[in-house]
């Protein structure tokens, strides 16, 4: 049994880091493998993660962590029984993938303005809470070409757009994702999408 593709890990910088790797053949990850992880600091405890299958030869492990800070550095040991298959390290702050924003809502009752709001996925005491910026994706269910991205570079989890920038009388969907420049993170996954019917009063034509 050998590791074909070494584990790579990403952290949500809150409580979970996810490591994925591939074996050289079909493997029952949960029965054959264990991923041990431990902070490099004095007296830290070693923890065991039981991996799950992720495709035939792929494995994924969700490492539980508390109160992640930039100094944290973990040793990782991948074991198959008594055999050490791979040894490495992982610094969560250098491999951050933020949590996806939630509760995306489209408020359509504000004159001819669409107000999109969502929730910051982090609690206020987490470092990322005040460092997230967002991308909002809006697309038409009827017209695949009607697809747009709005970059929200301010901290407030909301976006206002004129309803007239979208076509009237058709349904649209929106979703939002986040990233943090401070840790050069990857983008989060997209939030679940929300749907609304776009309609607004056309201004009277002037003759």
């Amino acid at each position: 049994m050998k590791v074909l593709q070494e584990p790579t890990c990403v952290s949500d910088y809150m409580s979970i880091s996810t490591c994925e790797w591939k074996m050289n053949g079909p493997t029952n990850c949960s029965t054959e493998l264990r991923l041990l992880y431990q902070l490099v600091f004095l007296l830290s405890e070693a923890h065991t993660c039981i991996p799950e299958n992720n495709g035939g030869a792929g494995c994924v492990c969700h490492l539980l962590m508390d109160d992640v800070v930039s100094a944290d550095n973990y040793t990782l040991d991948l074991w198959a029984g008594q055999q050490l298959l791979w040894k490495g390290s992982f610094k969560p702050s250098e491999h951050v993938k933020p949590r996806a924003p939630g509760n995306l809502t489209v408020h359509t009752n504000v004159s001819d303005t669409l107000l999109l709001t969502w929730s910051n996925p982090y609690p206020p005491d987490n470092y990322l809470y005040n460092h997230l910026t967002y991308a909002v994706n809006i697309w038409s269910e009827n017209d695949p070409a009607d697809f747009r991205i709005y970059n929200v570079t301010y901290l407030e989890p909301s976006l206002r757009i004129a309803a007239s920038t979208l076509k009237s009388g058709i349904s649209y969907r929106a979703r939002v994702r986040a990233w943090a420049q401070c840790y050069n993170t990857t983008w989060s996954e997209w939030s679940p999408s929300t749907k609304w019917h776009n309609s607004y009063r056309e201004p009277f034509e002037q003759h």
């Epitope: 007296l43 930039s70 550095n73």
Partner: antibody
Framework: EVQLVESGGGLVQPGGSLRLSCAAS????????MSWVRQAPGKRLELVAA????????YYADSVKGRFTISRDNSKNTLYLQMSSLRAEDTAVYYC?????????????WGQGTSVTVSS | DIQMTQSPSSLSASVGDRVTITCQAS??????LAWYQQKPGKAPKLLIY???NLETGVPSRFSGSGSGTDFTFTISSLQPEDIATYYC?????????FGGGTKLEIK
Amino acid sequence: EVQLVESGGGLVQPGGSLRLSCAASGFTFSSSYMSWVRQAPGKRLELVAAINSNGGKTYYADSVKGRFTISRDNSKNTLYLQMSSLRAEDTAVYYCTRQRGNYVGAMDYWGQGTSVTVSS
Amino acid sequence: DIQMTQSPSSLSASVGDRVTITCQASQDVSTALAWYQQKPGKAPKLLIYSASNLETGVPSRFSGSGSGTDFTFTISSLQPEDIATYYCHQYYGSPPTFGGGTKLEIK
């Protein structure tokens, strides 16, 4: 309100023993890593000993290894430092501290300190 | 052991001044560094952990930065109650070690 109250300090002759105690309240003692830090006159702060939450793992500074023993009683919310074969260089104010995380790192709560003087 | 060199060892500043203290580690300590404030006759108090994280309840005029071997502690606008000795503390290497302290006085 978090409180760490040390007791047991005093004057002791070289070669003698002392047992320091630290009564903790205001936080979940049984899940906290704890430690003892000392501050000798004109010397740097020094982490003397540390212990994990269940008492199963300990750390000692080289200067006290084999002479000091850190322990805890989670049912009494109390941390201890048994000091034996005391030397003049052990003279210091001893602080009971709580580790901020589940490892030896930054210390977020400190007691008021108890003074230990080793002298003949 | 990792040596922590703090500078200056003492400094005098006026109320409202921006005050900067530096701490240099003899080898890489990542961002495993804390800053403490100790007032005369009192126990040290944690201000900053993990090099730049402000401890809960600590005024925002205190800040920390740096990684590796070079660290900075800053008071953006000195207040009379900030008169104290400040210590850095690395906990990346074993044993954990402290700086010699910086005594801050008011002009």
